[in-house]
Structure formats: structure tokens, C-alpha cells
């Protein structure tokens, strides 16, 4: 699958959105008739690709959104598509990768000014442990960049996931970023689709590990929108 390509040791610890979404490619995404969105992921490769059908964004992986893959935007056929990176065109916040939101039709970074007024709201979403809210994001990985030091272990200071050892990602802990473990199968992964909400994460989580994506836990499908539990699940 695409996810295993992205998270394999060939591209060490390359998380979405660095390598695009962990899930399903969106080389031609159209959220509205007549608007064609070119693929936002230069690392995307298709390997026995199986599209994941969806009706809403919450049914897709953390770094995906739900839309029609065709130019016509036929609402009857929707699948999970790769989130859109910074400076790419968008129609709604869910289309943008973690750390970004949709502003004036473009995915832009959630800047630090979003933090102050909405801290309490974020904390209340917490499950109450160190890695308790919201999924992590990280920056582009420069594959050719020099190895300037040994990769960071859990708790080490980082700026992007390539600073961390294999099996770890770079995610916020309060107001700084540290290396945290990539999530394993069955572990809780929180999804959020509020404007700029990726920028509010006090305790970011890593993305789901190889071969996994963040989806609604099956027995929680009937629960209310606000309380549905997402976990890392096999494709």
C-alpha cells in the first residue's frame, strides 16, 4: 500500500504530510465541478492501490479527506484522498494537511496566534495523558540533508520527524516539539476538523505506523459525532 511505501525504511520515518497522506493517493482531486486539483504529493506511488470509499471526512485517515476523485465531482462516488499541503488549493479545512487550514481557497499554516484564545478548548479534548490529544504533524523531509547528529530518542528536542529515530515522530508537547512514538495498531488517534485546529494541539500525537490509518473504531460508528473514537487500524 501507499502507507507502507511512505513509512518503510526506504524513506525513513517519513510521515504524512511529508510524504503525503498515509492512505490513498489523490492525483486529481475535485471538490467542486470544474476545479481540478493536481496531486499534492511528490512521493506518491500506487502499489496495489485499493480506494477506501467514504461519505464524510471522519471516515478517512488522519491525513486524508473525503471527496470525489474525478473532475466532475460526482458526489455519489467518493473516496479518501491525500490531504493537501501548504500553498495548495482547497475548498474546506479538511482538505488541508495537519498544521494547515483552508483560507481563501489555499491551504495555509496554522500560525501561533491561534493558540492563546483556544487553549482550554484543546485541553478539554484531551484523553488525559501526555500524548492525549490530536494527531501530530511534521515538516517536509529533505532527503538529501546532511546527517548532522544521531537521531533523537523519545523525548529528544526536534523540529521535524527526520530529527527523530525510526519509530518516532516530531510532535508538540506543550509549546515545544519532542520525539514521540509512532502509534501502533489499536492505539487512539484523535481527528479534528475545526478551522486551524491542527495549530491548537498542545499534546500532539504521532501518526499511525506502517500499514495503519486513523479511522473510526467500528463499534463507535453509532456514537455521536463529537465522541466517536478513532484508532489506528489495518487497511
Amino acid at each position: 500500500t501507499l502507507n507502507s511505501v511512505l513509512n518503510s525504511n526506504a524513506i525513513k520515518n517519513l510521515p504524512p504530510p511529508l510524504g503525503g497522506a498515509a492512505g490513498h493517493p489523490g492525483s486529481a482531486v475535485s471538490a467542486a465541478p470544474g476545479i481540478l486539483y493536481p496531486g499534492g504529493n511528490k512521493y506518491q506511488t500506487i502499489d496495489n492501490y485499493q480506494p477506501y470509499p467514504c461519505a464524510e471526512d471522519e471516515e478517512c485517515g488522519t491525513d486524508e479527506y473525503c471527496a470525489s476523485p474525478t473532475r466532475g465531482g460526482d458526489a455519489g462516488v467518493q473516496i479518501c484522498l491525500a490531504c493537501r499541503k501548504r500553498r495548495k488549493r482547497c475548498m474546506r479545512h479538511a482538505m488541508c494537511c495537519p498544521g494547515n487550514y483552508c483560507k481563501n481557497g489555499i491551504c495555509v499554516s496554522s500560525d501561533q496566534n491561534h493558540f492563546r484564545g483556544e487553549i482550554e478548548e484543546t485541553i478539554t479534548e484531551s484523553f488525559g495523558n501526555d500524548h492525549s490529544t490530536l494527531d501530530g504533524y511534521s515538516r517536509r523531509t529533505t532527503l538529501s540533508s546532511k546527517m548532522y547528529h544521531t537521531k533523537g530518542q523519545e523525548g529528544s528536542v526536534c523540529l521535524r520527524s527526520s530529527d527523530c529515530a525510526s519509530g518516532l515522530c516530531c510532535a508538540r508537547h506543550f509549546w515545544s516539539k519532542i520525539c514521540k512514538p509512532v502509534l501502533k495498531e489499536g492505539q487512539v488517534c484523535t481527528k479534528h476538523r475545526r478551522k486551524g485546529s491542527h495549530g491548537l494541539e498542545i499534546f500532539q500525537r504521532c501518526y499511525c505506523g506502517e500499514g495503519l490509518s486513523c479511522r473510526i473504531q467500528k463499534d463507535h460508528h453509532q456514537a455521536s459525532n463529537s465522541s466517536r473514537l478513532h484508532t489506528c487500524q489495518r487497511h
Epitope: S109, F115, Q153, S156, V157, L159, H173, W175, S176
Partner: antibody, heavy 117, light 107 residues
Amino acid sequence: EVQLQQSGPELVKPGASVKIFCKTSGYTFTENTMHWVKQTHGKSLEWIGGINPHKGGTSYNQKFKGKATLTVDKSSSTACMELRSLTSEDSTVYYCARDWLGAMDYWGQGTSVTVSP
Amino acid sequence: ETTVTQSPASLSMAIGEKVTIRCITSTDIDDDMNWYQQKPGEPPKLLISEGNTLRPGVPSRFSSSGYGTDFVFTIENMLSEDVADYYCLQSDNLPYTFGGGTKLEIK
């Protein structure tokens, strides 16, 4: 009010070690990484490394590995940098600086280290 | 490691003039550039942080722009109190790297 108070100037002999302290107040110490920066006599700045007090995790600039060791004392909200095997090239001003979402927003007043026989 | 090249090294400007300082990075750093002011005997002061965000309490005559590898810091109408050294700092990747600094003086 956020404050970073650094220890006083140090005069040390070549080959010796020195510890510089950075006592913090006005914020929750464990919530921000602490960076250390070297400024060579009014010239440019160099990042030495950073330590996150939550688990004591560090990251160093390769250039300062073996030269600097970063630690924290959570009970006193104090960060510490030890510099060892000092030479004249280490004679300069060192700053601690608090991390805020990637930027270094509050800085200590600086500690001058002079290495002299 | 990302190298940050800052220019000019020194600048002599008249009061009221527009000041422009440039930093170029060796790798694409998105908009993860910060700008500092340092006066003699003082630590650096953060003026503008990632995303060209003016820090609270910093006068609006200071601004910055840029994305990717090319960044510009501007003082719209220079005042005597702006005499200082100015540094850029990239915070996209470790190790953090600073520009070489610009010494701003009054003409």
C-alpha cells in the same frame, strides 16, 4: 513575567570545565524546551543545543557534541550547561533561551566565560 | 545543515528611511524564519517569528516577508532607537542556524 536569570561571569583555566546556570520564573518550566546559544564577541550566534525538561531529552549541534552537556533541575526550574576541556576559543558569551513553537522568545542576560592561564 | 546568508553586513541609514535586510537559506524552509534585534550589552530580542508574525508589543514599522529560501526584513521609518544588530534565524530544521548579522547605524 517570564524571566531567565543566568549565573555570573566565569574565569577559568584552559582544560578546565565550567557550569552555567539559567534559573527560570514566570512560566511552567517543563512546558518549554531550553536552548543554549553561543555569541562570539559581538559576532554572530551559534545554536549549541536544546533540552526539553519533560523527559530531559536533548539535541546538540554536532559542532558542540563533547564540548557541551545540557541538564535540567525541574525542582528549581533551572537549566544548566557544562562546558568542558575549555580553550581560548570558548571565551565568549553564552545565552539560555526559551523555546516557543520553534522560535527562541525569551533570553537570559548572558554569561561571560573567560578562559585564561 | 541549512546555511543562512545575511546581507548586508552593515548598513548606514538616515532617520525616517526604509531599511531592508535580506537572508537567503541554502534549503527551502517554508516560512520558518525569525528575526531578532540585539542592542549592545543586551540579549537578542525576538521581533518577528515563523510565518512573518510580528511579536506582541513590537512596533508595526517592523515587518518581514518571504517563503522558501528568500527572506526580507523591513523597518519602514527608521528611528534612532532602531540602531542595533539584526539577525535572522531559521527554525525549520536542526541545527538551528543564524544569519551573520547586520549592523544598523545612523547616517
